[in-house]
Amino acid sequence: SSPTSSASSFSSSAPFLASAVSAQPPLPDQCPALCECSEAARTVKCVNRNLTEVPTDLPAYVRNLFLTGNQLAVLPAGAFARRPPLAELAALNLSGSRLDEVRAGAFEHLPSLRQLDLSHNPLADLSPFAFSGSNASVSAPSPLVELILNHIVPPEDERQNRSFEGMVVAALLAGRALQGLRRLELASNHFLYLPRDVLAQLPSLRHLDLSNNSLVSLTYVSFRNLTHLESLHLEDNALKVLHNGTLAELQGLPHIRVFLDNNPWVCDCHMADMVTWLKETEVVQGKDRLTCAYPEKMRNRVLLELNSADLDCDPILPPSLQTS
């Protein structure tokens, strides 16, 4: 009989059993070696087992697949392609599996894949066609609804000679495959900037998490196309001020909540518009917690308590009056 579990519990397949049948074709609902399976929950967990490749004998019923805490290194094209296909697979978690390369078409032949988590993998090489599967200018739409890419930045010495932001954005935009994406998490990736075209091409986004990056400015970023954005997480970045254009765009999004905690706000004359906006807007969560970081005399002052007299800029002296 198959080692697949009974109604409610997970079953672990014994390694010796797996090797005993390895010469034969896999049983249709066999549980791969080093994994736990629950047919009732349509779930397979191959967690913290130091796997170096995706098991080939995944049961056809799998809807939720956890391959976390492994040593996969590379995800090749068609890594999950099976005959018959894994037609039910909806949620795939590959976090913390030491992936440094995801190749073009890695997630092809997964027609129901709606959630993908690649977090905590040092992705030095993310193919532009990792999610679209082809290099066509317009690909077949991906079924992905949630894409979790938190902390995928590799150590500095392992990065390619190209912008990490650019590599990630190329994968997000290729073939316009991710037009249906509703949740995108890009937290903790040392992003210095957000390429200006990325948001315009993800019109279905409802949740965007850019927290714990190194974003200094949103001046060239437009949120206008994200008409139904519900949450924008910008906590723990390096933002100094939000300018009028950004404020107006955010205010024009009727369903948005914006999270701005723990940014080094510079409370000088350029902050006046943002302070006025904060006093009037309802879209910022916890706005009463936002405090100045600079200049020194303003440190820890609450933005909502400032008035225009507090927000001054030192006059710029003409060169003839400047001292060395």
Epitope: Q115, E146, R206, H228, E230, P254, H255
Partner: antibody
Framework: EVQLVQSGAEVKKPGATVKISCKVS????????MNWVKQAPGKGLEWIGR????????NYNGKFKGRATITADTSTTTAYMELSSLRSEDTAVYFC????????WGQGTLVTVSS | DIQMTQSPSSLSASVGDRVTISCRAS??????LNWYQQKPGKAVKLLIY???RLHSGVPSRFSGSGSGTDFTFTISSLQPEDIATYFC?????????FGGGTKLEIK
């Protein structure tokens, strides 16, 4: 698919308070916003208010402000709408609707206010 | 509050007909206009959001157009299962408001 299951029909006396619940399943793809909408017998739809479930932020239609209270319990993925000081014109079906654009709706809860 | 005026309040059409319903806002609502379908005893369904975007799983015979204050909802070829009441709704400016509804019947 997101599914919303509402609590059962209620009969209340004028002046009483009613609390209706709405449980969300298929939570992974559900929205943070939960709206409440009223439909009086043979009438159209009227928006009562909404809650952002993650932080409890609410918006209300001024017509219901002070009488309607919307809350959410994130641990059970359930939203609630409480309507106080009930009067006969509050007799209606009340719907919860998930999403900024109210993408998915519950089946409705009939509240009858009668002495 | 923004008033939403829907017309006609009822209409009768034959299977295969092209059906259009209008919705007018009392002030500019950009493209934040949604269309819903309500059948007796069934949950309300979102069909179209942001004027013309089809909600997931909605047949392509349903479409929407317009901007600003004037909007149109179209069923390109009426099917028997389309018999229902249709509502427009704006979500540009709080409080959200609905049109009065259009009851669609088969001739």
């Amino acid at each position: 698919e997101v599914q919303l299951v509402q609590s059962g029909a209620e009969v209340k006396k004028p002046g009483a308070t009613v609390k209706i619940s709405c449980k969300v399943s298929g939570y992974a793809f559900s929205s943070s916003w939960m709206n409440w909408v009223k439909q009086a017998p043979g009438k159209g739809l009227e928006w009562i208010g909404r809650i952002y479930r993650e932080d409890g932020h609410t918006n209300y239609n001024g017509k219901f402000k002070g009488r309607a209270t919307i809350t959410a319990d994130t641990s059970t993925t359930t939203a609630y709408m409480e309507l106080s000081s009930l009067r006969s014109e509050d007799t209606a079906v009340y719907f919860c609707a998930n999403g900024g654009a109210m993408d998915y709706w519950g089946q409705g809860t009939l509240v009858t206010v009668s002495s | 509050d923004i008033q939403m005026t829907q017309s006609p309040s009822s209409l009768s059409a034959s299977v295969g007909d092209r059906v259009t319903i209008s919705c007018r806002a009392s002030q500019d609502i950009s493209n934040y206009l949604n269309w819903y379908q309500q059948k007796p005893g069934k949950a309300v369904k979102l069909l179209i959001y942001y004027t013309s975007r089809l909600h997931s799983g909605v047949p392509s015979r349903f479409s929407g157009s317009g901007s600003g204050t004037d909007f149109t909802f179209t069923i390109s070829s009426l099917q028997p299962e389309d018999i229902a009441t249709y509502f427009c709704q704006q979500d540009n400016t709080l409080p959200w408001t609905f049109g009065g509804g259009t009851k669609l019947e088969i001739k």
